[in-house]
């Protein structure tokens, strides 16, 4: 080994070197949180970049760059260090127009903490392993969601567009002429029935067990879907999103009430099956796989 490489190895294995890097990262993180940093922090930034460059140079000189088995670029954690340094110099010396977008990559410096703290490195390693193991469960989840999304599509397509429309129109008004002239929320409230405090027109249905309209209103299928058009089963993608919402139980009871009011109470069976399978079974299966991966990593 050359004297330079010997010195580099000595520095690299020294505990003070690790401490220096860890302190640098933490200090850098503190500086990144500053709202309106003073001018002198620019020099501190250069110092941080210098220390990171020095750390990488030491690692490269000690281990080699990329040819051998244990060289600098063969360790994925060093890719992060490399990217951090490259972006530091890019944002500083190259005029790339939208620099603020590139500055976002400075946040990656905080991730360097993982490679420095051994315990954290193990946990993240376990997390990555669990993601690899999750692939099968994810395929199963997407498959189940897709199947139920297709069922939902067949059962409820267009149902959430059912609204209670005012019957007593002016003599020359028709449904179409009204829909062509409606612009504001107030216009909509004039012709459709709204429950107090509701931002969407009252939903209704055409089956006997679905929601009925109050006197003076009739059920029609017109206009957009509830929640600014985001809640529907009109296409596979919207149905899939609705099913994902059921699986994660994200305000699912509202979707449940809307659909049952528009389609009929019988369809509660669909929601019971989805909640049991998707929300209780699949979510817990995902958690079990993650737990197993952590257990394996610890052993």
């Amino acid at each position: 080994f050359s004297p330079l490489r010997r010195i580099s190895i000595k520095i690299l294995v020294h505990s003070l070197f690790s401490m220096l890097i860890m302190c640098t990262i933490l200090t850098n993180c503190i500086f990144m949180t500053m709202n309106n940093p003073p001018d002198w922090t620019k020099n501190v930034e250069y110092t941080f970049t210098g220390i990171y460059t020095f750390e990488s140079l030491v690692k490269i000189l000690a281990r080699g760059f990329c040819v051998g088995e244990f060289t600098f670029l063969r360790d994925p954690w060093n890719w992060l260090d490399f990217v951090v340094i490259v972006f530091a110099y890019l944002t500083e010396f190259v005029n790339l127009g939208n620099v603020s977008a590139l500055r976002t990559f400075r946040v990656l410096r905080a991730l360097k903490t993982i490679s420095v703290i051994p315990g954290l490195k193990t946990i993240v390693g376990a997390l990555i392993q669990s993601v690899k193991k999750l692939s099968d469960v994810m395929i199963l989840t997407v498959f189940c969601l897709s199947v139920f999304a297709l069922i939902g599509l067949q059962l409820f397509m267009g149902n959430l567009k059912h609204k209670c429309f005012r019957n007593s129109l002016e003599n020359n008004e028709t449904l179409e002429s009204i829909m062509n002239t409606l612009e504001s929320e107030e216009d909509f409230r004039k012709y459709f029935y709204y429950l107090e405090g509701s931002k969407d027109a009252l939903l209704c249905g055409f089956s006997t067990d679905s929601g009925q309209c109050p006197e003076g209103y009739t059920c029609v299928k017109i206009g957009r879907n509830p929640d600014y058009g985001y809640t529907s089963f009109d296409t596979f993608s919207w149905a899939f999103l609705a099913l994902f919402r059921l699986m994660t139980q994200d305000y699912w009871e509202n979707l449940y009430q809307q659909t049952l009011r528009a389609a009929g109470k019988t369809y509660m069976i669909f929601f019971v099956v989805v909640i049991f399978l998707g929300s209780f079974y699949l979510i817990n299966l995902i958690l079990a796989v993650v737990a197993m991966a952590y257990e394996e990593q610890n052993q």
């Epitope: 007593s168 449904l175 009739t218």
Partner: nanobody, 124 residues
Framework: EVQLVESGGGVVQPGGSLRLSCAAS????????MRWYRQAPGKQREFVAR???????GYADSVKGRFTISRDQAKNTVYLQMNSLRPEDTALYYC??????????????????WGQGTLVTVSS
């Protein structure tokens, strides 16, 4: 496809009576309102009477007290009973309805549908 068919028109003497009917056919789920309009030769179409699905009625001033609108929910039919007919009632009578129906492919559609019209002639 939804169709509205009017019937009951014909020639009648002033002061006489006629009963027009308008039947809606197709895979109908709900009929909101049903309205009668008329168009005399060389004139614009004018509103005559209306009935909603909860049987609320409304009439044009010119026919109030003489004409009565009614409907048979089960048969998806609306009737216009015309009494004390006058020569100025001579016109082609149209039926219009707000219908929600199941269309091709099983999807639901709401829209305003019109009939072809039935001719009423009041003359001595």
């Amino acid at each position: 496809e939804v169709q509205l068919v009017e019937s009951g028109g014909g020639v009648v003497q002033p002061g006489g009576s006629l009963r027009l009917s308008c039947a809606a056919s197709g895979r109908i789920l709900r009929i909101g309102y049903m309205r009668w309009y008329r168009q005399a030769p060389g004139k614009q179409r004018e509103f005559v009477a209306r009935i909603t699905d909860d049987s609320a009625t409304g009439y044009a001033d010119s026919v109030k007290g003489r004409f009565t609108i009614s409907r048979d929910q089960a048969k998806n039919t609306v009737y216009l009973q015309m009494n004390s007919l006058r020569p100025e009632d001579t016109a082609l009578y149209y039926c219009e309805a707000l219908v929600t129906a199941s269309v091709r492919g099983g999807s639901i559609h709401s829209g305003t549908y019109w009939g072809q019209g039935t001719l009423v002639t009041v003359s001595s």
